[in-house]
């Protein structure tokens, strides 16, 4: 059962991956990003269900083609470094999903934008925090 | 000093066209974004679109997204809003507003919406 | 869309009193520039709104330092030391850490 310090650990650790998250689509969604119409047209994958931890493994695999994307933001406006920020987000997602049960993601027929990504896993992440607190 | 004056507002019918001006002075109005937004009577501010500096890249609110059309003329100082499809909501004051600087390097400063016009009234009624 | 929502509503207040006005979000807007860009705004009856505050707490030129904005993250607030005659109307939280959105607006008139 967890305790209320591993109940405390999780929530700080979705703080920060909602935070990071948040972060990301700010720099992104904003008519100042000259990359924005060229952004929008990758797509992604969208998790069948979203609903506990373990269903963070749908975020892990994205990450990589995130990072891809995010690559094409860097300018003097977009401050993050793509590869730091996407490293900090997997170590967080591997800590909250766990590594103890392998977890095959089942993805939705219908691909995303990155914005429809980002704000997706932003309310994953505010569901839970709700149920932690 | 900073002026922005709009024109063109009026009563329109639904389903039919208006044109919407703001005149700019008093700054460099190439190296700025501009903006435009309304305020339907007794009711908030809602954005409405945005072009930036040398017109490449023009955003719209979904309410407008296909009937309304930002454009910009840096050779006259002046910012337009073509309205297609006029519908009844669409009833409003219309400003202009400044948006943010860009340097020569496509790098922005300084804070949107930091000066704004007087307005200009759209009705939209049968 | 980012929701920006103010309380209250409505302000009666007294001459030379304080006044606070809050606006919450519904997204973080810290951007990825570290900026956070919430500003607030001042529209008289009549005229069109004015900047008043802009990234939380940077006035904007010629606003008296009666005005004060502070906030972080989600949780903004913008304080009137002593309310004098001129500062009746509506005053608005936006943002633009992503594409614009205004808060509904709290009006503040003298009691």
């Known amino acids: 059962a967890p305790t209320s310090s591993s109940t405390k650990k999780t929530q700080l650790q979705l703080e920060h991956l909602l935070l990071d998250l948040q972060m990301i689509l700010n720099g992104i969604n904003n008519y100042k990003n000259p990359k924005l119409t060229r952004m929008l047209t990758f797509k992604f994958y969208m998790p069948k269900k979203a609903t506990e931890l373990k269903h963070l493994q749908c975020l892990e695999e994205e990450l990589k083609p995130l990072e891809e994307v995010l690559n094409l933001a860097q300018s003097k406006n977009f401050h993050l470094r793509p590869r730091d920020l996407i490293s900090n987000i997997n170590v967080i997602v591997l800590e909250l999903k766990g590594s103890e049960t392998t977890f095959m993601c089942e993805y939705a027929d219908e691909t995303a934008t990155i914005v429809e990504f980002l704000n997706r896993w932003i309310t994953f992440c505010q569901s839970i925090i709700s149920t932690l607190t | 000093q900073v002026q922005l004056v709009e024109s063109g507002g009026g009563v329109v019918q639904p389903g039919r066209s208006l044109r919407l001006s703001c005149a700019a002075s008093?700054?460099?109005?190439?190296?700025?974004?501009m903006h435009w937004v309304r305020q339907a009577p007794g009711k908030g501010l809602e954005w409405v679109a945005v072009?930036?500096?040398?017109?490449?890249?023009?955003y719209y609110a979904d309410s407008v997204k296909g009937r309304f059309t930002i454009s910009r003329d840096n050779s006259k100082n002046t910012l337009y809003l073509q309205m297609n499809s006029l519908r009844a909501e669409d009833t409003a004051v219309y400003y202009c507003?400044?948006?943010?600087?860009?340097?020569?390097?496509?790098?922005?400063?300084?804070?949107?919406?930091?000066?704004w016009g007087q307005g200009t009234l759209v009705t939209v009624s049968s | 869309d980012i929701v920006m929502t103010q309380t209250p509503l409505s302000s009666p207040v007294t001459l030379g009193q304080p006044a606070s006005i809050s606006c919450r979000s519904s997204?973080?807007?810290?951007?990825?520039?570290?900026?956070?860009?919430l500003s607030w705004l001042h529209q008289r009856p009549g005229q069109p709104p004015r900047l008043l505050i802009y990234?939380?707490?940077n006035r904007f030129s010629g606003v008296p330092d009666r005005f004060s904005g502070s906030g972080a993250g989600t949780d903004f607030t913008l304080k009137i030391s002593r309310v004098e005659a001129e500062d009746v109307g509506v005053y608005y939280c936006?943002?633009?850490?992503?594409?614009?959105?205004f808060g509904g607006g709290t009006k503040v008139e003298i009691k």
């Open positions: 072009i930036w500096y040398d017109g490449i890249n023009k």
């Open positions: 997204h973080n807007l810290i951007h990825s520039d570290g900026n956070t860009y």
């Open positions: 990234k939380i707490s």
């Open positions: 008093g700054f460099t109005f190439s190296t700025y974004a």
């Open positions: 936006m943002q633009t850490s992503q594409f614009p959105t």
């Open positions: 507003a400044r948006g943010s600087y860009y340097d020569s390097s496509g790098y922005y400063y300084g804070e949107d919406f930091d000066y």
